[in-house]
């Protein structure tokens, strides 16, 4: 008789999840020699231990602490780039601007990027059929709690000027319910962070509006100011040209506004 299995509303664990996490860990240490001390088998064991045999709606930050400890990494605190709803461009930027880091440029972020995972209470099985959806099922699921934990730690580590890339094509350029809006903004440390600088990325070729005047940006400014952190905002009218100018800053066309 097949065992009854909880049906969740979200997609199941990414196929080859254990193999992918382990492979990513080894790849990360290969391309970041300063992280070669990391034992990837121990990292996988700690990752697995955070959610295996646990109810996937009852995961806590505490569950991830062994993994957080193994993945401890020092990134330059003044070179942090946060992003919201514009991951690809943020990653293209840090690929060119090698001294800046998104969360996914750190070991733990790299391990979990674009993956889904969950287990089942009281069995050592990984659930490849379905996992809890944040809205429809529960917020304390393995994936959401992981990103909340690493995002909080990443924001807490930031100092000086922190940059955030925001998607100007969305109805809510700043969304209080995003990871940036609900976690990172509230965990920037005012005693360390002087300024949050928002880069609003325009989508349309002919879009010349000043999106820094958008009501949601004003809302972000208000939240940040109340936390005793300065706020500044820049429009990035031409993201393609922006990246090109990061690559080749001496190009003559890079003096004009981008």
């Amino acid at each position: 008789v097949p065992r009854w299995r909880q049906q969740w509303s979200g997609p199941g664990t990414t196929k080859r999840f254990p193999e992918t996490v382990l492979a990513r860990c080894v790849k990360y240490t290969e391309i970041h020699p300063e992280m070669r001390h990391v034992d990837c088998q121990s990292v996988w064991d700690a990752f697995k231990g955070a959610f295996i045999s646990k109810h996937p709606c009852n995961i806590t930050e505490e569950d991830y602490q062994p993994l957080m400890k193994l993945g401890t990494q020092t990134v330059p605190c003044n070179k942090i780039l946060l992003w919201s709803r514009i991951k690809d461009l943020a990653h293209q930027f840090t690929q060119v601007q090698r001294d800046m880091f998104t969360l996914e440029d750190t070991l733990l972020g790299y391990l979990a990027d674009d993956l889904t995972w969950c287990g089942e209470f009281n069995t050592s099985k990984i659930n490849y059929q379905s996992c809890p959806d944040w809205r429809k099922d529960c917020s304390n699921n393995p994936v959401s709690v992981f990103w909340k934990t690493v995002s909080r730690r990443f924001a807490e580590a930031a100092c000086d000027v922190v940059h955030v890339m925001l998607n100007g094509s969305r109805s809510k350029i700043f969304d209080k319910n995003s990871t940036f809006g609900s976690v990172e903004v509230h965990n920037l440390q005012p005693e360390k962070v002087q300024t949050l600088e928002a880069w609003v990325i325009h989508g349309g070729r002919e879009d010349s509006r000043d999106l820094c005047q958008d009501p949601t940006i004003k809302e972000l400014e208000s939240i940040i100011s109340k936390r005793n952190i300065q706020f500044s905002c820049k429009n990035i009218y031409r993201p393609d040209k922006f990246l090109q100018c990061v690559k080749n800053p001496e190009d003559s066309s890079c003096t004009s506004e981008i």
Partner: antibody
Framework: QMQLVQSGAEVKKTGSSVKVSCKAS????????MHWVRQAPGQALEWMGW????????DYAQKFQDRVTITRDRSMSTAYMELSSLRSEDTAMYYC?????????????WGQGTLVTVSS | AIQLTQSPSSLSASVGDRVTITCRAS??????LAWYQQKPGKAPKLLIY???SLADGVPSRFSGSGSGTDFTLTISSLQPEDFATYYC?????????FGQGTKLEIK
């Protein structure tokens, strides 16, 4: 079994570009960093750069920074190395290579090599 | 970039001889060193990784030692198929670098 199969020999004119391919089989392409190494006739091996096939992220040796581009096609499990503004000193055997994850970060697997000849 | 200096650049030896090739790094590379064998017209073959670990399928007459800046590849009893060029490589940090090679010839 694990194989890296490279494209055939190329003869190129000075100032032109060459694009060498490396088709991977027998393993999950995105699980391993792919490196490119070259060897001029009678010379030592020279590391050129790497690509993470999963994300397309790259890093290059400073010497080649302005002239080399490493890309990949995930659907074809193939990595590419393009070298531009060719000069006679670029005449060499070009290899793709990867580690085994169990052998430190030494290159346990190599393509058969692609000879690129640059003539004026 | 880390420089690797191999010595000798060439050597002649006979079948059955014990042969030692050295590789010196310009800075500490811990044990992040590999040794390769290359025959004419062929791709290099990994012999030793992490300075002293034997790669799969490599005969036990090959051994590696050393850490830090000084490393050695030893072939305990030369066989006819061992006549080739040998390279050391550091993977401690980027850019990865190789030694200039040691050509092992039949005496």
């Amino acid at each position: 079994q694990m194989q890296l199969v490279q494209s055939g020999a190329e003869v190129k004119k000075t100032g032109s570009s060459v694009k060498v391919s490396c088709k991977a089989s027998g393993y999950t392409f995105t699980d391993y960093i792919m490196h490119w190494v070259r060897q001029a006739p009678g010379q030592a091996l020279e590391w050129m750069g790497w690509i993470d096939p999963e994300y397309g992220r790259t890093d290059y040796a400073q010497k080649f920074q302005d002239r080399v581009t490493i890309t990949r096609d995930r659907s074809m499990s193939t990595a590419y190395m393009e070298l531009s503004s060719l000069r006679s000193e670029d005449t060499a055997m070009y290899y793709c290579a990867r580690s085994a994850h169990t052998t430190g970060f030494g290159f346990a697997y190599w393509g058969q090599g692609t000879l690129v000849t640059v003539s004026s | 970039a880390i420089q690797l200096t191999q010595s000798p650049s060439s050597l002649s030896a006979s079948v059955g001889d014990r042969v030692t090739i050295t590789c010196r790094a310009s800075e500490d590379i811990y044990s992040n060193l590999a040794w390769y064998q290359q025959k004419p017209g062929k791709a290099p073959k990994l012999l030793i990784y992490d300075a002293n670990s034997l790669a799969d399928g490599v005969p036990s007459r090959f051994s590696g030692s050393g850490s830090g800046t000084d490393f050695t590849l030893t072939i305990s009893s030369l066989q006819p198929e061992d006549f080739a060029t040998y390279y050391c490589q550091q993977y401690n940090n980027y850019p990865y670098t190789f030694g200039q090679g040691t050509k092992l010839e039949i005496k």
